[in-house]
């Protein structure tokens, strides 16, 4: 499966939208930094087949969609930017789902690496727990926004490696 060029552009647009979403100066939030334990090894793309890598990317985007679809999120971020953000995420999910369908029967390995999916879910659970503990404060959301931007940048690297594997 070839991930379309539009997918890469959508990823870039997602990062640009997130960069615009800031509401307060992040300089006031330094003390709220937190180690969410980003599962770097799941995005190295060396240890599993292409279909499994796609499923991990899909899970990360789905979890991001869920995180930013809450009422607490809607109360924090600009509605217009959020709508654009959802559109881009939806586009990426569709691309990855189409890709996963094409990979059915292409590889002998399972389409999903359950352990990797669970690792990504636990990562997002830690993010949600942090937000809850911080009572969804503006600074907590700034820290989460920075974390998600970083994770999207790292996942973009995995997507590029997948494209070079074609």
């Amino acid at each position: 499966c070839d991930l379309p060029q539009t997918h890469s552009l959508s990823n870039r647009r997602t990062l640009m939208i997130m960069a615009q979403m800031g509401r307060i100066s992040p300089f006031s939030c330094l003390k709220d930094r937190h180690d969410f334990g980003f599962p770097q090894e799941e995005f190295d793309g060396n240890q599993f087949q292409k279909a499994q890598a796609i499923s991990v990317l899909h899970e990360m985007i789905q979890q991001t969609f869920n995180l930013f679809s809450t009422k607490d999120s809607s109360a924090t971020w600009d509605e217009t930017l959020l709508d654009k953000f959802y559109t881009e995420l939806y586009q990426q999910l569709n691309d990855l789902e189409a890709c996963m369908m094409q990979e059915v029967g292409v590889e002998d390995t399972p389409l999903m690496n359950v352990d990797s999916i669970l690792t990504v879910r636990k990562y997002f659970q830690r993010i949600t727990l942090y937000l809850t503990e911080k009572k969804y404060s503006p600074c907590a959301w700034e820290v989460v926004r920075a974390e998600i931007m970083r994770s999207f940048s790292l996942s973009a690297n995995l997507q590029e490696r997948l494209r070079r594997k074609e």
Epitope: A19, G22, S25, P26, F27, S28, C29, L30, K31, D32, R33, H34, D35, F36, E142, V143, A146, E147, M149, R150, S153
Partner: antibody, heavy 121, light 107 residues
């Protein structure tokens, strides 16, 4: 390879203006903040201020607020430190260093080589 | 501003010695403390971040500990290349502040 390359040494007279630069390469320039640190001859490190190149938001140490201006041009991955009127006491080595912002990652993990500024009449 | 106080300001040690440098913050900074090494004419180099995390490429003889207000940098077995000045820096809040430095000299 991540690099921060600073502009060359400067010799200036009191009252003159100056702008020194720090060019980042080998990483996404807008994903990291750039901090500036002063080291006067034979002395320790003093944090001056920081900039987020993605939107040019800045924060200064109270000691340097109003004394210097930090700016950035993300189109050329470069941060700047400038003075409108230099004093002899500005004589020092100035370093830039990258900072991960609100991410849980090493602070000031890469540094420029330093720019020596000498102010003398 | 958060004040950072290092001790000692200088020390003399021999190759193979265990060296300990302490840093105290004027208020709690959780674990938001970094340690840097600087050699004459060179830019500082990050050794330890968030109190105890070893920066990539830094020898394992360097270690950091502490939280709250009291922190320690330990060099388990001093090597010739370790003679330098060491700085702590609080990463908890702006303005960021450094300790005054500890110079490690050859005995």
């Amino acid at each position: 390879e991540v690099q921060l390359v600073q502009s060359g040494a400067e010799v200036k007279k009191p009252g003159e203006s100056l702008k020194i630069s720090c060019k980042g390469s080998g990483y996404s320039f807008t994903s990291y903040w750039i901090g500036w640190v002063r080291q006067m001859p034979g002395k320790g490190l003093e944090w001056m201020g920081i900039i987020d190149p993605s939107d040019s938001d800045t924060a200064y140490s109270p000691s340097f607020q109003g004394q210097v201006t930090i700016s950035a041009d993300k189109s050329i991955s470069t941060a700047y430190l400038q003075w409108s009127s230099l004093k002899a006491s500005d004589t020092a080595m100035y370093y830039c260093a990258r900072h991960p912002g609100l991410n849980w990652a090493p602070d000031f993990d890469y540094w420029g080589q330093g720019t020596l500024v000498t102010v003398s009449s | 501003d958060i004040q950072m106080t290092q001790s000692p300001s200088s020390l003399s040690a021999s190759v193979g010695d265990r060296v300990t440098i302490t840093c105290r913050a004027s208020q709690s900074i959780d674990g938001a403390l970094n340690w840097y090494q600087q050699k004459p004419g060179k830019a500082p180099k990050l050794l330890i971040y968030f109190a105890s995390s070893l920066q990539s490429g830094v020898p394992s003889r360097f270690s950091g500990s502490g939280s709250g207000t009291d922190f320690t940098l330990t060099i388990s077995s001093l090597q010739p290349e370790d003679f330098a000045t060491y700085y702590c820096q609080q990463a908890y809040d702006f303005p960021l502040t450094f300790g005054q430095g500890t110079k490690v000299e050859i005995k």
